[in-house]
């Protein structure tokens, strides 16, 4: 079965800079899975942001600002990366990755 690890326990960024969050997949080939990213703001319910499927298709939640989030995966390191552009107060949250095994 697949296993996920987010090596960065926390990430501190200056306003307007770019943040990159990593999710390392083990126990399964990343190319055979879909990786989902969610965020949980303080005091709010968890919210789906973006996913990248086994065939590379990216799906974004409607209502999420365009250009704010980018998702990628690197088969060589079995890693999915969530990039957050122009970091703002509204982006302060705990970010989770999740796996869907095809």
């Amino acid at each position: 079965a697949g296993h996920l690890e987010q090596p960065q326990i926390s990430s501190t960024k200056t306003l307007s800079k770019t943040a990159r969050l990593e999710c390392v997949v083990s126990g399964i080939t990343i190319s055979a899975t879909s990786v989902y990213w969610y965020r949980e703001r303080p005091g709010e319910v968890i919210q789906f942001l973006v996913s990248i499927s086994y065939d590379g298709t990216v799906r974004k939640e409607s209502g999420i600002p365009s250009g704010k989030f980018e998702v990628d995966r690197i088969p060589e390191t079995s890693t999915s990366t969530l990039t957050i552009h122009n970091v703002e107060k509204q982006d302060i949250a705990t970010y989770y990755c999740a796996l869907w095994e095809v």
Partner: antibody
Framework: EVQLVESGGGLVKPGGSLRLSCAAS????????MNWVRQAPGKGLEWVSS????????FYADSVKGRFTISRDNAKNSLLLQMNSLRAEDTAVYHC???????????????????WGQGTMVTVSS | DIVMTQSPGTLSLSPGERATLSCRAS???????LAWYQQKPGQAPRLLIY???SRATGIPDRFSGSGSGTDFTLTISRLEPEDYAVYYC??????????FGRGTKLEIK
């Protein structure tokens, strides 16, 4: 001195347009979320719109959605509110207000409008 | 949308007395997103309390905030002459982001 100064108010006929401006000084404008809040004569406060520091997140009250547009120019320390299709019920003093910003303590994510302008009066009447 | 209900509408108290103002939300509000303001005639509002219980810069310690969930309270321990004003609670949420209560007018008895 931290300051917000609104301008652009005035008398306009129903269906008309106005553009409000808010000039910010005394702080790093690009680091703060900004808001417009209005107050009709003798009434309470009504939040109108907000815009995040890099303009990614923009929200409107249902009462103005589709008619008002908020924007900002971080290079000019300026907040704008374009108001179209104005109605009599839009008559109010319009304040711009700054959100608390990001602190480095445990309350870093708390919200609250900590700096307000004195407001500009908008009157919609035929 | 979350509706914020403030009570009482008007509160008449004498200087030196304790004032207790209530704010009730129509659904749960994280204390992170609850603020209180004071407004005097002809002036812009002033932030008193954010995060339900944290005093804003320069606010005297006779002002305190408490509460969680749907019930929040602003307390003024000993009323001073300059405290007579209208007080508003406000929540930050996701749809729409900000909503204010209708206010409590604190007047001299």
């Amino acid at each position: 001195e931290v300051q917000l100064v609104e301008s652009g108010g005035g008398l306009v006929k129903p269906g008309g347009s106005l553009r409000l401006s808010c000039a910010a000084s005394g702080f790093t404008f690009s680091h703060y979320d900004m808001n417009w809040v209005r107050q009709a004569p003798g009434k309470g406060l009504e939040w109108v719109s907000s815009i995040s520091s890099s303009s990614s997140y923009i929200f409107y009250a249902d009462s103005v959605k589709g008619r008002f547009t908020i924007s900002r120019d971080n290079a000019k320390n300026s907040l704008l509110l374009q108001m179209n299709s104005l109605r009599a019920e839009d008559t109010a003093v319009y304040h711009c207000a700054r959100d608390r910003g990001v602190g480095d303590t445990s309350d870093y994510y708390s919200f609250g409008l900590d700096v307000w302008g004195q407001g500009t009066m908008v009157t919609v009447s035929s | 949308d979350i509706v914020m209900t403030q009570s009482p509408g008007t509160l008449s108290l004498s200087p030196g007395e304790r004032a207790t103002l209530s704010c009730r939300a129509s659904q749960n509000v994280s204390s992170t997103y609850l603020a209180w303001y004071q407004q005097k005639p002809g002036q812009a509002p002033r932030l008193l309390i954010y995060g339900a219980c944290s005093r804003a810069t320069g606010i005297p310690d006779r002002f305190s905030g408490s509460g969680s969930g749907t019930d929040f309270t602003l307390t003024i321990s000993r009323l001073e002459p300059e405290d007579y004003a209208v007080y508003y609670c406000q929540q930050y949420g996701s749809s729409p982001p900000y909503t204010f209560g209708r206010g409590t007018k604190l007047e001299i008895k």
